[in-house]
């Protein structure tokens, strides 16, 4: 038996590794948007600039009509940045007016809409207060987090005010997944 | 009301490298991709590339190895070299803004014919 | 890159005609087709954008419809201004490419 090699009992089974290449992803930049027609109880969608710029798509990863598709089941990270800019006036005003086309928060959600469910689902939702900062005011809110996404889903980013989002800069306004 | 205004010399010879400016007035030059597009004689339009206010390219394929833009967001203009040039490039020349790819190009400069001769 | 052809290459009409154009993409290229006017010695005017949205200022019997690689514009009642050549164009990718133009002339 002198210099005979054993096989271990349980020997593990590797699968070949996938190359990040590959796989879904895209990173999408703010745009100049249109007034459009949303959703009874649904903040607004966010259009944006799928191949210019810094924007991408890539591995079937597909932009279309304000949604990214996703292409295929698994873990995805999810992300989005907001930039919001206006003034402080706009706060008194609300109060003084009743304008309740200006608020005095911001908020941005990322949804998800699957075909087979019939209400969209809010995956990850960020507020912040605008009437306690400066007098021209710039407010990021940046959200991100890991979900399990189906084939067919689809994802968008909803503001509470689209005429406030900043988007001058793609580095400031942007929203992106990648399959891990 | 935005202008665009393209100017440089009508005439290049072979070889040599053409140079187009683009002045943008009544508007900044930032947070929009500013085009290219040439439309030679009897043709189509050609794309030639774009450039973004942050300095950023892309270009036609077709053109990449002869083509460089730049950009001045200090004076609102921004430019084209086409090196090694023929007599196939010769075209009207036009630069145009396209705010994202969902808006097409919005606004465009009146041309400027570029003629390659000897 | 994706090829964008139209049809007719030339039509005649008269003016108060209904005329249509149509451009075909040779892949998908969602909704990102625009449409243009060029008249000679000027510059393409941008008519509508997005498939079907009609820019600032322009009248609204232009219109333009489709998804996908097959697409089309309508005039509802063609103007002695309309006149002109007509362009389509895919801003789905770069490079951007235009079809070769549809000439409209005076029947």
């Known amino acids: 038996l002198k210099g005979q090699e054993f096989a271990p009992s349980h020997q593990q089974v590797y699968a070949p590794l996938r190359a990040d290449g590959d796989k879904p992803r895209a990173h999408l930049t703010v745009v100049r948007q249109t007034p459009t027609q949303h959703f009874k109880n649904q903040f607004p969608a966010l259009h944006w600039e799928h191949e210019l710029g810094l924007a991408f798509t890539k591995n079937r990863m597909n932009y279309t009509n304000k949604f990214l598709l996703i292409p295929e089941s698994g873990d995805y990270f999810i992300y989005s940045q907001v930039t919001f800019r206006g003034m402080t006036s706009e706060c008194s005003e609300i109060r003084q007016a009743g304008r309740p086309n200006k608020p005095d928060s911001i908020t941005v959600v990322i949804t998800k809409v699957t075909d087979s469910y019939p209400e969209p689902t809010q995956l990850l939702m960020g507020t912040k207060s605008v009437c306690e900062v400066g007098s021209n005011w710039f407010q990021p809110i940046y959200l991100g987090a890991m979900f399990s996404l189906q084939e067919g889903d689809k994802l968008m980013v909803n503001v509470s005010d689209i005429s406030l989002v900043d988007y001058t800069k793609e580095d400031k306004t942007f929203f992106g997944a990648f399959l891990l | 009301q935005v202008q665009l205004q393209e100017s440089g010399p009508g005439l290049v010879k072979p070889s040599e490298t053409l140079s187009l400016t683009c002045t943008v007035s009544g508007g900044s030059i930032s947070s929009y991709f500013w085009s290219w597009i040439r439309e030679p004689p009897g043709k189509g339009l050609e794309w030639i590339g774009y450039i973004y206010y942050s300095g950023s390219t892309n270009y036609n394929p077709s053109l990449k190895s002869r083509v460089t833009m730049s950009i001045d967001t200090s004076k609102n203009q921004f430019s084209l070299k086409l090196s090694s040039v023929t007599a196939a490039d010769t075209a009207v020349y036009y630069c145009?803004?396209?705010?994202?790819?969902?808006?097409?190009?919005?606004?465009w400069g009146q041309g400027t014919l570029v003629t390659v001769s000897s | 890159d994706i090829q964008m052809t139209q049809s007719p290459s030339s039509l005649s009409a008269s003016v108060g005609d209904r005329v249509t154009i149509t451009c075909r993409a040779s892949q998908s290229i969602n909704n990102y087709l625009n449409w243009y006017q060029k008249k000679p010695g000027k510059a393409p005017k941008l008519l509508i954008y997005?498939?079907?949205s009609l820019q600032s200022g322009v009248p609204s019997r232009f219109s333009g419809s489709g998804s996908g690689t097959d697409f089309s514009l309508t005039i509802s009642s063609l103007q002695p201004e309309d006149f002109a050549t007509y362009f389509c164009q895919q801003s789905y990718s770069t490079p951007r490419t235009f079809g070769q133009g549809t000439k409209v002339e005076i029947k």
């Open positions: 997005a498939t079907s």
């Open positions: 145009a803004r396209e705010i994202g790819s969902y808006y097409g190009f919005d606004y």
